[in-house]
């Protein structure tokens, strides 16, 4: 049973590697050559299509057996060597072989441009096993070609070590034009040259281009792909394509927008988005860029107040975030504000000015003019100072706190007063004799605490001394004051 | 009909060489490949390589390489197995099997096997 | 090397069951796998080729599937001359391997 010839026919997705092959019914051998001994290479034809043998790519093997037989010389048939179709056909194709059994080994592989062709799920591969010859025929087939088909396909056999290779079959998909390069979209300068360009490829070739402004034909003779149009300026947005023409027709770009640069719109939505007392925090909308990327931004700050001088303070800032803190500005003070930004073209106008204001601040100086006495009759600390200039104040006083410490014998206490706005002087109990008393005086108004005056010292005696003197607020560089009674 | 014929059983000691024959009978021997397969008592199946019948080129699996020699006699439609310096390991049934076809490596026809006892 | 793994040492069947066999492959062996029954004492005796093609003369209640790494070797209406040893191999690429086997026996 097994020495009958048989035809083995069966689909193998995976290359290289062993054939697929099933024994199946009885057929007379489609080949036929003489028996291995004595064995004289013989005449091979496809057994699809008969046709005459190639010698191109014949392989004689080098392996000798012990007993020196040579094994005879292998070589693919002749096939189609150059299929044209169209885009989304099917193709099929094949290399067939007739390989002596005395091979024993062989595995056949699908390459395309170099590439090995794992995987190929369309190959199938059949064969035809008689007692003396195996018949091989591997079919590629796509059911669907695209572009990226198109090559250079050949079958390897690889036998004994030896690499047997067909024919060379060249695929080669036609169809419209196929853009490698379409025209892109351009912000432009007004007046100003620019280029645009058009690359198309079929097969088949030649490709022509033919450009089209706004509708309307820009070339009266086409040009051969690649096409490189030069506009010498526009004054006015237009849109441009290209249309790629071969013998199977026309293939349309894409149309791109042409803009002209222009100076931006303003900004819109100018908002507040915290206040303190000697900043604000802004953020804005961007108004359209005018083709042109923003550049950098510039924020105008004038004080509202109808008696100042108008005088406007710039601060400039990168485009981005669209975010700026405006600092070094007075504390309860009102500001109008608008923000303008730029791109390569110019300046926008200015945003729609706002109002925004300044909180209350702590007071940025201390009372001055600190004068301590000792009310020895009394039993009493008077304190004597003047209030910190108005725009130091940094909003409307509430009081004062005071701040005396007691130090004797290593003892030392800390004491806070509250003093309402209006005074400006205070009277403290004394809390230790034989003492040294520090005073030091804030202004407060409803932001907060504002820095205490230097130290001002005055020794409180034991009962019974008699002459007391003031003591103040030391000129600047001068050492604590100390009152000795 | 096609039919692989071995050698019989063989007791060897442990340093010994045994040499195994195939004999073919049914076919054109020098039209397919020989090989042999390994399979140790209780054990599965081992490809040890096979043989060029017409150009007597041997293959042989790595852990095969060394002490194994795969041979023929052509005109006796003969192969064999040659087992040099024999270890406990090498105590088996050793199969010759016939490559299918030039395109297929599966095995159509076993022979009924030798079983080699390496004993001290 | 390419790795096959036969997970079913032992398999227990009744007479007239069905049957399934499986064999994973470590990668892509395409459908280049056979199966083959062994019986104590006797060769290996193909039964499938090209992972579904019956070899000649076996009967139609064996069945082969599967391609790439999963393969199946399926028998109907077990009948009591089926228990033996069943190996799968593989032979894409060299060296050709084995299946360790998976033993049929009786519940």
């Known amino acids: 049973a097994i020495t009958e010839a048989r035809e083995e026919a069966k689909p193998y997705p995976l290359f290289p590697g062993p054939f697929p092959g099933s024994l199946q019914t009885d057929h007379t051998p489609l080949l036929s050559l003489p028996h291995a001994s004595g064995y004289q290479p013989a005449l091979m034809f496809s057994p699809t299509q008969p046709g005459r043998p190639h010698t191109g790519n014949v392989a004689i093997p080098q392996v000798t057996s012990v007993e020196s037989k040579p094994l005879p010389p292998l070589a693919f048939k002749h096939t189609v060597g150059h299929i044209i179709l169209s885009e989304h056909k099917g193709v099929k194709f094949n290399c067939s072989i007739s390989v002596p059994n005395i091979y024993q080994d062989t595995t056949i592989s699908w390459w395309k441009d170099g590439k090995e062709l794992l995987g190929a799920h369309h190959a199938i591969t059949q064969f035809y096993p008689d007692d003396e010859v195996t018949a091989i025929i591997a079919s590629f087939s796509i059911t669907s070609v695209q572009r990226s088909d198109n090559g250079s396909y050949i079958c390897k056999m690889k036998i004994n070590n030896e690499e047997i290779v067909s024919d060379p079959i060249y695929i080669e998909v036609q169809g419209l034009p196929h853009f490698t390069k379409q025209p892109e979209s351009m912000n432009v300068t007004r007046n100003t040259a620019f280029n645009l360009t058009c690359q198309a490829v079929g097969p088949p070739e030649p490709v022509n281009i033919f450009w089209v402004q706004n509708s309307s034909r820009v070339n009266e003779q086409p040009e051969k792909s690649p096409s490189v149009l030069t506009v010498p300026g526009l004054t006015e947005m237009a849109v441009f394509s290209c249309e790629a023409h071969n013998d199977k027709g026309l293939t349309v770009s894409k149309g791109v927008q042409i803009n002209i640069k222009a100076i931006p719109s303003p900004p819109t939505e100018v908002s507040i988005r915290n206040s303190t007392a000697h900043s604000i925090l802004i953020s804005w909308v961007p108004g359209f860029d005018g083709y042109s990327p923003f550049r950098n931004c510039s924020i105008q700050v004038k004080e509202a107040d109808p008696l100042s001088n108008g005088s406007v303070m710039i601060f400039n800032t990168s485009a981005l975030p669209h975010l700026y803190q405006i600092k070094q500005l007075q504390a309860l003070a009102n500001y109008s504000i608008g923000v303008s930004c730029m791109n390569e073209i110019g300046w926008s106008a200015v945003s729609p000015w706002i109002l925004a204001s300044t909180t209350e601040g702590a007071p940025s100086v201390a009372p001055l003019n600190v004068t301590v006495f000792l009310n020895e009759s009394s039993d009493n600390v008077d304190i004597r100072w003047m209030k910190p200039p108005t725009k130091q104040q940094d909003g409307e006083l509430v009081g004062y706190r005071i701040s005396h410490v007691w130090q004797s014998a290593g003892i030392s206490k800390e004491l806070l007063e509250e003093v309402g706005q209006n005074g400006s002087r205070a009277r403290i109990s004394v809390q230790v004799h034989n003492a040294t008393c520090t005073v030091r005086i804030a202004a407060v108004t409803r932001g907060g605490v504002g820095p205490f005056s230097d130290p001002v010292k005055i020794f409180i005696p034991a009962h019974g001394w008699v002459d007391y003197a003031p003591s103040s607020t030391p000129a600047p560089g001068n050492a604590d004051p100390v009152l000795i009674i | 009909q096609v039919k692989l014929e071995e050698s019989g059983p063989e007791l060897k000691k442990p340093g010994e060489t045994v040499k195994i024959s195939c004999k073919a009978s049914?076919?054109?021997?020098?039209?397919?490949?020989m090989n042999w397969v390994k399979q140790a008592p209780g054990k599965g199946l081992k490809w040890m390589g096979w043989i060029n019948t017409y150009t007597g080129e041997p293959t042989y699996a790595d852990d095969f390489k060394g002490r194994f020699v795969f041979s023929l006699e052509t005109s006796a439609s003969t192969a064999y197995l040659q087992i040099n310096n024999l270890k406990n390991e090498d105590m088996a049934t050793y199969f010759c099997a016939r490559k299918s076809t030039v395109v297929s490596r599966y095995f159509d026809v076993w022979g009924a096997g030798t079983t080699v006892t390496v004993s001290s | 090397d390419i790795v096959l793994t036969q997970t079913h040492k032992f398999m227990s069947t009744s007479v007239g069951d069905r049957v399934s066999i499986t064999c994973k492959a470590s990668?892509?062996?395409?459908?280049?796998v056979t199966w083959c029954q062994q019986k104590p004492g006797q060769p290996p005796k193909l039964l499938i080729y090209w992972a579904s093609t019956r070899h000649t003369g076996v009967p139609d209640r064996f069945t082969g599937s599967g391609s790439g790494t999963d393969f199946t070797l399926t028998i109907n209406n077990v009948q009591s001359e089926d228990l033996a040893d069943y190996f799968c191999?593989?032979?894409?690429?060299?060296?050709?391997?084995f299946g360790a086997g998976t033993k049929l026996e009786l519940k």
């Open positions: 191999q593989q032979y894409r690429s060299y060296p050709l391997t």
């Open positions: 990668q892509d062996v395409g459908d280049a």
């Open positions: 049914g076919y054109t021997f020098t039209n397919y490949g």
